[in-house]
């Protein structure tokens, strides 16, 4: 599940938010490492209300959430974390 998502596209996020999103509102998270056309790490969150937001990777709440998800990565994740590798 925790592969790396590489892309040759430029940055996806035109603005980022630090506003906390409760986990129960989150449907999916995608992490895009820096490089390959974008100089910064990007975190994209799909919410259950059919909205999508870029989260500031420096936001404490998302760092905590990602740490929890990494620790649980051996079991079923309540929030899917997508880091698929694109050839």
């Amino acid at each position: 599940v925790l592969e790396v998502y590489y892309t040759s596209l430029r940055c996806r996020c035109v603005q980022e938010s630090s506003v906390f999103i409760p986990r129960r509102f989150i449907d999916r998270i995608q992490i895009l490492p820096r490089g390959n056309g974008c100089p910064r790490k990007e975190i994209i969150v799909w919410k259950k209300n059919k909205s999508i937001v870029c989260v500031d990777p420096q936001a404490e709440w998302i760092q905590r959430m990602m740490e929890v998800l990494r620790k649980r990565s051996s079991s079923t994740l309540p929030v899917p974390v997508f880091k698929r590798k694109i050839p």
Epitope: C13, V14, W46
Partner: antibody, heavy 122, light 107 residues
Framework: QVTLKESGPGILQPSQTLSLTCTFS??????????VGWIRQPSGKGLEWLAN???????YSNPSLQSRLTISKDTSNNQAFLTITNVDTADTATYYC??????????????WGQGVRVTVSS | DIQMTQSPSSMSASLGDRVTITCQAS??????LIWFQQKPGRSPRPMIY???NLANGVPSRFSGSRSGSDYSLTISSLESEDMADYHC?????????FGSGTKLEIK
């Protein structure tokens, strides 16, 4: 190449039910993040958002029409549908369907159909 | 619901003029705004997304800006092909709402 095309009755009478079909290609409503919306435009006036339906059958509609409006889809035939019951002359408009894809950057209604003109007249 | 107040409703300008159209949001929409151009007899197409970003294929004479709750579309030097209706859309929350539209004509 993404295309959408609306079809409908053209003309109908007050109190009847309007049924519209959006037939699309170039994307699938089974794909995560895909949605189709309906928007209408009375002649010479502005746009009004009516409803969205998403890949997982989640639906959102305009509260001003919610009691009369139903949105649905047929993924196997790449179609989305809109019905409005008990129509009135105020429902006379060009009706558009448009695609939305939940990707970043998110641009709702990035592709539109050509529109279908609907006239409600007695 | 979020109201989008668009002005002017119509305007006439000369070729080469700088033209600005504004939408004011009744609540904070945090740049969740798109500008659509609709040429006569055609469907709308997105020109500006997230308030300030140019969509693919849009000429650089178009730009978007924000000042508080006011969102503006500016054409730096009007060309004849810019004659169209322009609509703003907020997509911060449902129900999505459009401005009332601006008809831009060439003098």
């Amino acid at each position: 190449q993404v295309t959408l095309k609306e079809s409908g009755p053209g003309i109908l009478q007050p109190s009847q039910t309007l049924s519209l079909t959006c037939t699309f290609s170039g994307f699938s409503l089974t794909t995560y993040g895909m949605g189709v919306g309906w928007i209408r435009q009375p002649s010479g006036k502005g746009l009004e958002w009516l409803a969205n339906i998403w890949w997982d059958d989640d639906k959102y509609s305009n509260p001003s029409l919610q009691s009369r409006l139903t949105i649905s889809k047929d993924t196997s035939n790449n179609q989305a549908f809109l019905t409005i019951t008990n129509v009135d002359t105020a429902d006379t408009a060009t009706y558009y369907c448009a695609r939305s894809e939940l990707v970043m950057p998110y641009v709702p209604f990035d592709y539109w159909g050509q529109g279908v003109r609907v006239t409600v007249s007695s | 619901d979020i109201q989008m107040t668009q002005s002017p409703s119509s305007m006439s300008a000369s070729l080469g003029d700088r033209v600005t159209i504004t939408c004011q949001a009744s609540q904070d929409i945090d740049n969740h705004l798109i500008w659509f151009q609709q040429k006569p007899g055609r469907s709308p197409r997105p020109m500006i997304y997230y308030a300030t970003n140019l969509a693919n294929g849009v000429p650089s004479r178009f730009s978007g800006s924000r000042s508080g709750s006011d969102y503006s579309l500016t054409i730096s030097s009007l060309e004849s092909e810019d004659m169209a209706d322009y609509h703003c859309l907020q997509f911060k929350q449902y129900p999505f709402t459009f401005g009332s539209g601006t008809k831009l004509e060439i003098k």
